[in-house]
């Protein structure tokens, strides 16, 4: 019951992290114009990851799409790219951590698969998590930087090179949606990855011992014969001795963390 | 069409108050931003303030702040300058105008005439 | 405040020929998120509320005839009548849209010669 409303409520909470992590990415406060030397101004300035808006006293907002890619930051191109893989790992790891939810039943599917889909969903959220931390993380030390690097602009216009105060960015509501959402689905994640160690079957009266043959990497189980590869754990994870023979969890291939870079 | 009708004129003794009314039609009331300007006889355009008729919020000219008051009651589309403290100086034509793209002041009304005299 | 001057204070120009009114700004109009120049003009005629010829330095409001035109960048601005027509006798007032408050040039009376 424990591990069902644990994965249940990691589930939810990665649900709301991605939800969080798409809603930061579209959105167009990423950073806002500075308002403390002047905080009541006729124009507004913010900007997203995909484009800037300028918001007039008077109501009206003007926007304009990034429509160059080789002319922007290279640190903007790499926010960009950490929040969609965070977004796409987020969606595969929703994807299948719906088919691995204990209250869901599809088929025959067994504890030992839902344990394992339920692992890897709960490792893709947490990178999709770290991912989402990492791009709003870079960004605003973008800003930082930006912040006091910025003092006076030169700019040319119609009447000739004309001195203007540069507009200084500050971070913007994206920036802590994005945070928050990050953080969230890094919890979900670990407490799916939490959930994935109860998953297995209840224990037997006997201890399942993969006896490694010389041959063949064949794990035989007692009571039964019933062969399996050593892939997806049927049982808990504990130690039985330190010599040859070893629990089917300790055999199991965990992904790397170069698996999803 | 958007029009902008203001009260009549008044004439008011010094230290006296003055509330001009700015009645709008032909467009949502809440749409736009509307700013007070003033007009001195045979002077330049000497801007009030503006009131955001959709949250109420206010901007003031630091000339007028404290003696100036800007209201707007959505049910009526109506807006409302009260000027206080009233002095022979603020003898003017006051004209409510809509603020549109650009911050520009698109629509104006014809004018109140405020006469402030003992 | 972002102070406004107008230059000349009056101006005659004879009917058909090229009117050139300038406005100077104490402080850049530009905004760097848009790079548009919040300059407007207006002509106000005797008796009658001030009318919006040009907003954004140099866009057109809809209806205004294109011989007037709006030019400058930064904290020089000028608005060019190509043309002067009998119905454009009147004041023309430069505004600065982009910070509080907004100011008003002190107008620039234009007459014909």
């Known amino acids: 019951m424990a591990v069902t409303a644990c994965q249940g409520l990691g589930f939810v909470v990665s649900l709301i992290g991605i939800a969080g992590i798409i809603a930061a990415t579209c959105m167009d406060q990423w950073s806002t114009q500075d308002l403390y030397n002047n905080p009541v101004t006729a124009v507004f300035n913010y900007q997203g990851l995909w484009r800037s808006c300028v918001r007039e006293s008077s109501g009206f907002t003007e926007c304009r799409g990034y429509f160059t890619l080789l002319g922007l930051p290279a640190m903007l191109q790499a926010v960009r790219a950490l929040m969609i893989v965070g977004i796409v790992l987020g969606a595969i790891g929703l994807l299948v951590s719906i088919f691995a939810l204990k209250c869901i039943r599809i088929g025959s599917m067994e504890d030992s698969a839902k344990a394992n889909m339920t692992l890897t969903s709960g490792i893709m959220f947490i990178v999709s998590g770290l991912c989402a931390i990492a791009g709003v993380s870079v960004f605003a030390n973008m800003l930082v930087t930006n912040f006091w690097m910025s003092t006076a602009n030169m700019y040319t216009g119609m009447g000739g090179m004309v001195q203007t105060v540069q507009t200084r960015y500050t971070f913007g509501a994206a920036l802590f949606v994005g945070w928050v959402a990050g953080g969230l689905t890094l919890i979900g994640g670990v407490m799916m990855c939490i959930a994935c160690r109860g998953l297995a079957p209840e224990e037997t009266n006997y201890k399942a011992v993969s006896y490694h043959a010389s041959g063949h990497s064949v794990a035989y189980k007692p009571g039964g014969f019933k062969a399996s590869t050593g892939f997806g754990s049927n049982t808990k994870n504990k130690k039985i001795y330190d010599g040859g023979a070893r629990t089917e969890d300790e055999v199991q291939s965990y992904p790397s963390k170069h698996d999803y870079v | 069409q958007v029009q902008l009708v203001q009260s009549g004129a008044e004439v008011k003794k010094p230290g006296a108050s003055v509330k001009v009314s700015c009645k709008a039609s032909?467009?949502?009331?809440?749409?736009?931003?509307i700013n007070w300007v003033r007009q001195a006889t045979g002077q330049g355009l000497e801007w009030i303030g503006e009131?955001?008729?959709?949250?109420?919020?206010?901007y003031y000219s630091e000339k007028f702040r404290g003696r100036v008051t800007l209201t707007a009651d959505t049910s009526i589309s109506t807006a409302y300058m009260e000027l206080s403290s009233l002095r022979s100086e603020d003898t003017a034509v006051y004209y409510c105008?809509?603020?549109?793209?650009?911050?520009?002041?698109?629509?104006w009304d014809q004018g109140t005439t405020v006469t402030v005299s003992s | 405040d972002i102070v406004m001057t107008q230059s000349p204070s009056s101006l005659a120009v004879s009917l058909g020929e090229m009117a050139t009114i300038n406005c100077k700004s104490s402080?850049?109009?530009?905004?760097?998120?848009?790079?548009?120049?919040?300059l407007t003009w207006y002509q106000q005629k005797p008796g009658q509320p001030p009318k919006l010829l040009i907003y954004?330095?140099?866009t057109r409001e809809s209806g205004v005839p294109d011989r007037f035109s709006g030019s400058g960048s930064g904290t020089d601005f000028t608005l060019t009548i190509s043309s002067l027509q009998a119905e454009d006798v009147a004041v023309y007032y430069c505004?600065?849209?982009?910070?509080?408050?907004?100011?008003f040039g002190q107008g620039t009376k234009l007459e014909r010669k």
């Open positions: 505004q600065n849209s982009y910070n509080y408050p907004y100011t």
């Open positions: 032909g467009y949502t009331f809440t749409s736009y931003v």
């Open positions: 009131i955001h008729p959709r949250g109420g919020n206010t």
């Open positions: 402080q850049s109009l530009l905004n760097s998120g848009n790079q548009r120049n919040y």
């Open positions: 954004w330095a140099s």
């Open positions: 105008a809509i603020l549109r793209r650009g911050n520009a002041m698109d629509y």
